[in-house]
Interface confidence: low
């Protein structure tokens, strides 16, 4: 059981108060983290509270302002980037969000040597992406879907691509589906380590069907938003990878990197690019049927000025029980010999572990092993490998940082974080300086988050970067709910759950239960992290018990659990939520007449199917922006888990797993359906079809739409949403307002 800071600091019961919905909507109890912006082995930049950009040198203990808040304010800058030669800073303003990662902005270049903005050959606006070379101060940027290069900020630009066209050809930036489901970035260009070459992707969306939806705005006529968006089974983007020599860009122009023959024989994806040296690059490709991935190491041929990808440097990763990788196929971390690498993939027992590949995948040396999973490789140096895993004390929802000494024989393993602040900190990430001379640890909980700086050689803590003292003080008089993380063993399946209990929880009493579900493939909801959010309020003030359950399909507990849902979405995820509810009822403190379920996105899909399961367990439930049929969702994501919606593949389950097919079963539950009309991700179409099916079945339900809101339902919509859902649940549970 994890006891959250509650009455620890103050025993006087009457000075304590419950959380309010207003606390949550105002972000009163939000926390801060500190991620250094490393610029060398021992220096980092940080934006101070008063918006100065400050350079810190760990070894001298000195700090100085490299850019004043006055300069930042002069162009309304909200972000910055220092050139590696430290001569220039780009300042970013006029931020305009596009999709999850992408945005456009205006960029100004500030010359630190003379304290003035660079005049002449200014950058066009708005720019879709801009970055410095890793060495010096070359600039690459994307404007109107074309890539441009500047040797120096004041120079005229060299145009690298010319075929860029809105919604048709994307150079150096991903299209919608690659951004959301494959790269998870706003960029698709990569500098070589010393800035000699620039690699970039070209996405051709010419043949992709377009999703169109109305954006109502304030005008007399709504605008139509058009996005090339391949749904399951539709035509996909065609991707090509090019590399250009940035020293002499006009000499031979961009050179295409060949696709491995076994990949090119049918539809495929590019999944990531990793530079090894200035003249060696590693590309990862994936078949459209996403159980085969190929890692291809390519070398620059000086004589031909081309890139050669020999078959002997192709490494195949294949899954026979599911899809390749976890959520994404893992990326390699190369060692100092510039040919061997470390990579996370499934071992023979079906657990994701670190392997060392020197020649072939078949001869890979397994570095970690056990009935737990390695999750991320942070850094490989000459003598150490730093990674995170959930090994410690067998809690899958924890993350600790480990160091393996690869310089000594046999290699030894040390947990860097396990015993640092054991009660407070069980879920870490890390950020390393060059050569791992120093690193920052960011602890997310279960106690109040804290960020610390450490020596990369000794692991000694140097200083606290952020400890959220104000938050700690603010929480002293708050009755926070109790949280416990435990597991259920059902039919050889382990179901981990997090239960959030009212502050004065009494096992002899009966409480309404709310299940919060996400449940998507390779997700994890039961994590040892700190949060004061809507469900904290529901437990603290409204006396509800809230439970989160990680069922089949969820991550970091081995392939058996993960791949159980392969080609069968919407079955086991729902079953496992229902099984857990039955187990919770058996615990004796749940009022079985007052059980609800809610979820967002994939969670909205699962909550809808659970409500329509015909079990009679749920009195009511909420689906926010749910998927309703996998035929409506993005090809890259959907087909990874479901295959194709064709008769000779998996069409039957596509049809059987829709929410609409279960419309009749909503008759005996109270259902609240919510969606943003401008959702570019899970299209409003999904909820429109649920509503239509319910109307056609003459089933009563409640609904709320949010005009011009996307999948995140942000801004004032957030307040309206949570207020509305609170009223719905309180009414369902017969709680007075």
């Amino acid at each position: 059981i994890v006891l959250r800071p509650s009455r620890v600091h103050n025993s006087e019961e009457n000075t304590m108060r419950a959380l309010t919905l207003k606390d949550i909507l105002n972000g009163t109890f939000s926390y801060k983290t500190f991620f250094p912006n490393w610029i060398s082995g021992q220096e980092y930049l940080h934006q101070s509270a008063d918006n100065n950009i400050v350079l810190y040198n760990i070894e001298t203990g000195q700090s100085y302002t490299i850019l004043s808040n006055r300069t930042m304010k002069s162009v309304n800058a909200s972000n910055y980037g220092l050139s590696p030669d430290r001569q220039f800073v780009y300042l970013e303003s006029d931020y305009s969000k596009l999709w999850r990662y992408s945005y456009t902005a205006t960029y100004y270049i500030y010359d630190l040597s003379n304290g003035e903005f660079v005049r002449g050959n200014e950058l066009p606006r708005p720019i879709q992406y801009l970055c410095w070379s890793p060495v010096g101060s070359k600039l690459a940027y994307v404007y109107q879907n074309n890539i441009y290069l500047k040797q120096r900020p004041g120079d005229p630009p060299f145009q690298i691509t010319f075929n860029g066209r809105e919604n048709k050809i994307f150079n150096g930036i991903p299209d919608w589906v690659y951004e959301e489901e494959m790269l998870a970035t706003k960029y698709a260009l990569w500098w070589s380590p010393n800035g000699k070459f620039l690699a970039y992707a070209e996405f051709n969306d010419t043949d992709i069907p377009v999703i169109a939806y109305s954006y109502y705005g304030d005008e007399q006529y709504p605008r139509t938003i058009n996005i090339p968006y391949p749904k399951a089974g539709a035509k996909n983007p065609v991707v090509r990878i090019f590399i250009i020599d940035t020293t002499y860009p006009a000499y031979v122009g961009p050179q295409e990197v060949p696709v491995p023959a076994m990949i090119a024989s049918s539809d495929y994806y590019f999944s990531w690019l990793t530079w090894v040296t200035d003249e060696r690059v590693c590309l990862q490709w994936l078949k459209r049927v996403q159980n085969v991935s190929v890692l291809s190491i390519c070398d620059f041929r000086e004589d031909w000025q081309t890139w050669d990808c020999p078959k002997t440097q192709e490494h195949i990763e294949e899954s026979r029980t599911g899809w390749a990788g976890g959520f994404f196929v893992s990326t390699p971390v190369f060692s100092y010999d510039a040919i061997s690498y470390y990579k996370i993939f499934s071992d023979k027992d079906g657990y994701k572990h670190i392997h060392y590949i020197k020649d072939t995948v078949e001869n890979a040396i397994q570095i970690t092993s056990g009935k737990w999973e390695a999750i991320n490789i942070f850094r490989v140096t000459q003598d150490s490998l730093f990674y995170s895993s959930n090994e410690f004390e067998e809690y899958p929802g924890r993350r600790n940082i480990y160091r393996i000494s690869i310089g000594s024989y046999p290699p030894s393993k040390k947990c860097v974080t396990c015993h640092l602040r054991k009660e407070r900190c069980q879920y870490y990430t890390a950020s390393f300086s060059d050569y791992a001379k120093y690193y920052a640890l960011v602890c997310y909980g279960p106690g109040i988050p804290i960020s610390t700086l450490h020596d990369g050689r000794t692991d000694q803590e140097i200083k606290i970067l952020e400890e959220n003292k104000e938050l700690e003080n603010a929480l002293k008089n708050i009755q926070l709910p109790k949280e416990e993380i435990k597991k259920l063993e059902v039919d050889e399946i382990t179901l981990w759950y997090k239960m959030i209990l009212p502050p004065q929880f009494d096992r002899s009493k009966k409480y309404p239960l709310l299940i919060q579900v996400y449940g998507g493939p390779c997700s994890q909801s039961v994590r040892s992290v700190f949060a004061v959010n809507w469900i904290s309020y529901l437990a603290s003030k409204e006396g509800m018990v809230i439970a989160l359950v990680d069922g089949r399909g969820t991550a970091f507990q081995g392939d058996k659990l993960l791949y159980a849902v392969y080609r069968k979405l919407g079955v086991y995820e729902v079953e496992d939520q229902i099984t857990a509810v039955r187990k919770f009822i058996e615990m004796g403190f749940i009022d079985e007449k007052r059980i609800a379920i809610w979820g967002w996105s994939y969670g909205g899909y699962v909550s809808s199917l659970a409500l329509a399961s015909g079990t009679g367990l749920f009195k009511c439930g909420i689906a926010v922006a749910p998927v309703s049929s996998w035929e409506y969702y993005a090809s890259v994501y959907t087909e990874r888990f479901m295959g194709l919606p064709t008769k000779d593949d998996n069409l039957e389950h596509y049809k059987n797993s829709t929410v609409m097919a279960r419309a009749e079963y909503f008759r005996n539950v109270d259902y609240l359906l919510i969606h943003g009309t401008a959702d570019d991700n899970v299209h409003f179409q999904n909820s429109a079809q649920i509503a239509k099916a319910l109307v056609n079945a003459q089933v009563d339900f409640q609904a709320m739409w949010y005009s011009d809101q996307n999948h995140g339902l942000s801004g004032l919509s957030t307040n309206h949403l949570y207020t509305h859902m609170t009223h719905f649940l309180k009414q369902c549970f017969s709680l007075s307002d």
Partner: nanobody
């Protein structure tokens, strides 16, 4: 339920014309290449026309090129085969087929294509005879 229903077959004199229609239901019509195959008595199925999804690229084998025209109407979920200058060797059962779209049309080799096609209709008889 997936259905492909052909119509428009019949008896026609050499040199004459026929227009075959195929009504599709039960799947996402726009995502599929559509094809017309034929099978003469004692022979294998052969592809006579194909039209891709989205970009309507057409394909014909040399034996029908210039005489047959395939078209589709995505809104009506229909695919058509206009057959002109018919010959006795065009006599066969004509099948409408839906093929999960790759960038190429269905394989010209009917037997190979049979394995990769999504759906088949029941067929309509075309007889060219004087």
């Amino acid at each position: 339920e997936v259905q492909l229903v052909e119509s428009g077959g019949g008896l026609v004199q050499p040199g004459g014309s026929l227009r075959l229609s195929c009504a599709a239901s039960g799947f996402i019509f726009g995502y599929y290449s559509m094809g017309w195959f034929r099978q003469a008595p004692g022979k294998g199925r052969e592809l006579v026309a194909a039209i891709s999804s989205f970009d309507d690229i057409t394909y014909y084998p040399d034996s029908v090129e210039g005489r047959f025209t395939i078209s589709r109407d995505n809104a009506k979920r229909m695919v058509y085969l206009q057959m002109n200058s018919l010959r006795a060797e065009d006599t066969a059962v004509y099948y409408c087929a839906a093929h999960y779209n790759r960038y190429a049309p269905p394989a010209a080799d009917g037997n190979t294509a049979l394995g990769t096609l999504g759906y088949w209709g029941q067929g309509t008889q075309v007889t060219v005879s004087s």
